[in-house]
Interface confidence: low
């Protein structure tokens, strides 16, 4: 049996994945639950099994097709239901009319690489993954650099207000180890949120030349 309030949040990666998290205050006693996606204007539907991620929340990924296939458009709407088994039948625990392009969260940027590094600056590039062609150039990025002795939370955010898949980091300290992360967000969508941060890219600035001012 299930009691208590629940929260059901899903995001579309703009191509072929809807990721959902369902939080439930009351205890679930060995109950099997799933998310069912039923598009109003498509010839498919999809289900994924909710798996626990904490004491009171479960998550799953609806895989709609090949990673780069465009499975939904800006006018699609998908009825998403959380279904939990009660004996021989399924009970609807939560339901939402999901507008994919109003609830976007892209995949984290990939293929981070150092293009050029000097004593005080470093040029880094990256690629976006599984992002819809619908966005054209309507994307923005945030980047952060981890300096020695600091935490990621302390790192200042650098904002790129356009689709620019590179950055030139300035005023770095010579011969110093840094880490760099970037995330992406489409401009479209009322409930759109930032992608996860990319995997950190570690790099080291060049040492200052002997006898030169640093």
């Amino acid at each position: 049996a299930v009691n208590g309030t629940s929260q059901f949040t899903c995001f579309y990666n703009s191509r072929a994945n809807i990721s959902c998290v369902w939080s439930q205050d009351g205890a679930l006693q060995d109950t099997s639950c799933q998310v069912h996606a039923w598009p109003d204007r498509r010839r498919w539907n999809q289900t994924c099994e909710l798996l626990p991620v904490s004491q009171a929340s479960w998550a799953c990924n609806l895989i709609l097709g090949a990673p780069d296939s465009q499975k939904l458009t800006t006018v699609d709407i998908v009825t998403l239901r959380v279904l939990c088994r009660e004996g021989v039948r399924w009970r609807v625990m939560a339901i939402q009319d999901f507008k994919p392009f109003e609830n976007l969260r892209l995949m984290a940027p990939i293929s981070l690489q150092v293009v050029h590094v000097e004593t005080h600056r470093c040029n880094i590039s990256w690629e976006i993954s599984q992002a819809s062609h619908y966005f054209e150039r309507h994307l923005e990025f945030e980047a952060r650099t981890l300096s020695p002795g600091h935490t990621w939370e302390e790192a200042p955010l650098l904002t790129l207000k356009q689709k620019q898949e590179w950055i030139c980091l300035e005023t770095l300290t010579p011969d110093t180890q840094y880490e760099f992360q970037v995330r992406v967000k489409p401009l479209q969508g009322e409930f759109t949120t930032w992608s996860p941060w990319s995997q950190p890219l570690a790099f080291r600035t060049k040492p200052a030349a002997l006898g030169k001012d640093t």
Partner: antibody
Framework: EVQLLESGGGLVQPGGSLRLSCAAS????????VHWVRQAPGKGLEWLGV???????DYNAAFISRLTISKDNSKNTVYFQMNSLRAEDTAVYYC?????????????WGQGTLVTVSS | DIQMTQSPSSLSASVGDRVTITCQAS?????MYWYQQRPGKAPRLLIY???NLASGVPSRFSGSGSGTSYTFTISSLQPEDIATYYC?????????FGQGTKVEIK
């Protein structure tokens, strides 16, 4: 058999309101979206809005300030209300449903109900 | 809004003729639909997803196209095909229709 039956049309005064019903049979409005389309006399088709299976709505921006689409799941009926009517709102109003809930296109239409806005 | 421009606005052809109607969208669309409307009747879906024949629709009707340019064809016009034909895009809200093409028999 899927059927849609509109009712509520007739003569309305300018500035008045209109409430149409679309009674569905052969399917449930909790499983399928229902759209509204109108056609002025001798003119083309104009999409007005939709109510989705879960109850959320999308409207044509040209009508958003005076249009409300709602439904009563227990009666399996969708309602269309438009306020501040003017002569140019005179039209046949249709409710329509997409094909198999899984493919696009308005495969099912009501017979339409004529609304005349005149004093 | 995406404007849908149909041409011609009307045409007259003989029974057995091949009839072609074009629909030009003001910007690129992914999905195109075609409807037939006989006088005093509700529209009837003929073509969905640009080129797929709706249930019960004769094979003389066909559709094609992509991007901003779409075509609807009746391979051999029949007397019962006298009607107005509409294209419709389902890629961006508001959903929009062409102004219609009236088909008559010579």
């Amino acid at each position: 058999e899927v059927q849609l039956l509109e009712s509520g049309g007739g003569l309305v005064q300018p500035g008045g309101s209109l409430r149409l019903s679309c009674a569905a049979s052969g399917f449930t409005v909790t499983s399928y979206a229902v759209h509204w389309v109108r056609q002025a006399p001798g003119k083309g088709l104009e999409w007005l809005g939709v109510i989705w299976s879960g109850g959320s709505t999308d409207y044509n921006a040209a009508f958003i300030s005076r249009l409300t689409i709602s439904k009563d799941n227990s009666k399996n009926t969708v309602y269309f209300q438009m306020n501040s009517l003017r002569a140019e709102d005179t039209a046949v109003y249709y409710c329509a449903r997409a094909g198999d809930a899984n493919y696009d296109g308005f495969a099912y239409w009501g017979q339409g109900t004529l609304v005349t806005v005149s004093s | 809004d995406i404007q849908m421009t149909q041409s011609p606005s009307s045409l007259s052809a003989s029974v057995g003729d091949r009839v072609t109607i074009t629909c030009q969208a003001s910007s690129s669309v992914s999905f195109m639909y075609w409807y037939q409307q006989r006088p005093g009747k509700a529209p009837r879906l003929l073509i969905y997803d640009t080129s797929n024949l709706a249930s019960g629709v004769p094979s003389r009707f066909s559709g094609s196209g992509s991007g901003t340019s779409y075509t609807f064809t009746i391979s051999s016009l029949q007397p019962e095909d006298i009607a107005t034909y509409y294209c419709q895009q389902w890629s961006t809200y508001p959903l929009t229709f062409g102004q219609g093409t009236k088909v008559e028999i010579k």
